[in-house]
């Protein structure tokens, strides 16, 4: 698994480098998670033909995965820093149950799946420090999450593979949108 941001030997070997700003740290953290997702997607796509599934087929799912919409203020048109930041944090918190589901779904990339999950927790902490209006952030209900997890794990094998593929694809898209928005802040 790749070394998490801020822990690679090059940082230690270069004492004169300027410490990363909060924004740079967040940017680096997101890119690190995206690398992890790419590795997981590679295993998923090699194992089955899920990656060839049409967008239409994937759209008809029972999941409620976070997605960026115009009203969230993260797009260039109608950009709103505070609203957008709340959406990013809320979305990441909602993704956590799906990242938990991904654990034990990979044979050769088990560590990678754990790294994505842990790095996302760190990213949430970074963003929460940046956010002023923490009251607007709703945390998912643990009981609801627990029953959702049970339901996802009860699916037949093909559905579980399809769900894994969809979670990775949606999480990647959400992080890419977040990265673009955060670069405007």
């Amino acid at each position: 698994a790749p070394v998490p941001p801020g822990e690679d030997s090059k940082d230690v070997a270069a004492p004169h480098r300027q410490p990363l700003t909060s924004s740079e740290r967040i940017d680096k953290q997101i890119r690190y998670i995206l690398d992890g997702i790419s590795a997981l997607r590679k295993e998923t796509c090699n194992k089955s033909n899920m990656c060839e599934s049409s967008k239409e087929a994937l759209a008809e799912n029972n999941l409620n995965l976070p997605k960026m919409a115009e009203k969230d203020g993260c797009f260039q048109s109608g950009f709103n820093e505070e609203t957008c930041l709340v959406k990013i944090i809320t979305g990441l918190l909602e993704f956590e149950v799906y990242l938990e589901y991904l654990q034990n779904r990979f044979e050769s990339s088990e560590e990678q799946a754990r790294a994505v999950q842990m790095s996302t927790k760190v990213l949430i902490q970074f963003l929460q420090k940046k956010a002023k209006n923490l009251d607007a952030i709703t945390t998912p209900d643990p009981t609801t999450n627990a029953s959702l997890l049970t339901k996802l794990q009860a699916q037949n094998q093909w559905l579980q593979d399809m769900t894994t593929h969809l979670i990775l694809r949606s999480f990647k898209e959400f992080l890419q949108s977040s990265l673009r928005a955060l670069r405007q802040m």
Epitope: S53, E60, N61, A154, Q155, N156, Q157, W158, L159, M162
Partner: antibody, heavy 120, light 111 residues
Framework: EVQLQQSGAKLVKPGASVKLSCTAS????????MHWVKQRPEQGLEWIGR????????KYDPKFQGKATITADTSSNTAYLQLSSLTSEDTAVYYC?????????????WGAGTTVTVSS | DIVLTQSPASLAVSLGQRATISCRAS??????????MNWFQQKPGQPPKLLIY???NQGSGVPARFSGSGSGTDFSLNIHPMEEDDTAMYFC?????????FGGGTKLEIK
């Protein structure tokens, strides 16, 4: 021709164990999931569990956990169902069935069934 | 577990007429545009035989008089025209979740 050949009828005493076999021909069990289903006289069908012979991963209905053990021997292309601590409630016909991985999820080939009678 | 309720428990239909068997699931068995509902026919002393998979797809070698429909929680199996050979027990089965579950069965006879 794709077939599942099951072992013959068994008459066993209460408290004993029994091991049923299901031998596949016309396909490799490693490419499928092998399931076991119970049917009591004049009753419905109950799923017991399944094995993925490629990695010996098993799943059971909680009500058969501890009662049933599913195994597979890929060299003989055979799946097994072992039932322990038998009681009259275990008197039934036991079917093995094949399930192929894919978009649709169904039992397409069934064995003829093995009748297990528990009696002293 | 997903509970499947079949109705009626028994049915008598005249030769050449239509037989309709219903199956209701305790929750939706749909996902990704697929209905994970299958139908089986079972004759005395024989194993179940696949008739319909994915709610409406015919199993291999199944006569065209057998058809399935429905989505979500409500499904039905239609047999038309009814033939002598169709006297049997019919079961619905969901494969969306583990454990896969079966309906209680419908006994179809000739009137």
């Amino acid at each position: 021709e794709v077939q599942l050949q099951q072992s013959g009828a068994k008459l066993v005493k209460p408290g004993a164990s029994v091991k049923l076999s299901c031998t596949a021909s016309g396909f490799n069990i490693k490419d499928t999931y092998m399931h076991w289903v119970k049917q009591r006289p004049e009753q419905g069908l109950e799923w017991i569990g399944r094995i993925d012979p490629a990695n010996v991963n098993t799943k059971y209905d909680p009500k058969f956990q501890g009662k049933a053990t599913i195994t597979a021997d890929t060299s003989s292309n055979t799946a097994y169902l072992q039932l322990s601590s038998l009681t009259s409630e275990d008197t039934a016909v036991y079917y093995c069935a094949r399930l192929l991985y894919g978009r649709y999820w169904y039992f397409d080939v069934w064995g003829a069934g093995t009748t297990v009678t528990v009696s002293s | 577990d997903i509970v499947l309720t079949q109705s009626p428990a028994s049915l008598a239909v005249s030769l050449g007429q239509r037989a309709t068997i219903s199956c209701r699931a305790s929750e939706s068995v749909d996902n990704y545009g697929i209905s994970f509902m299958n139908w089986f026919q079972q004759k005395p002393g024989q194993p179940p035989k696949l008739l319909i998979y994915g709610a409406s797809n015919q199993g291999s070698g199944v006569p065209a008089r057998f058809s399935g429909s429905g989505s979500g929680t409500d499904f039905s199996l239609n047999i038309h025209p009814m033939e002598e050979d169709d006297t049997a027990m019919y079961f619905c089965q969901q494969s969306k979740e583990v454990p896969p579950t079966f309906g209680g069965g419908t006994k179809l006879e000739i009137k």
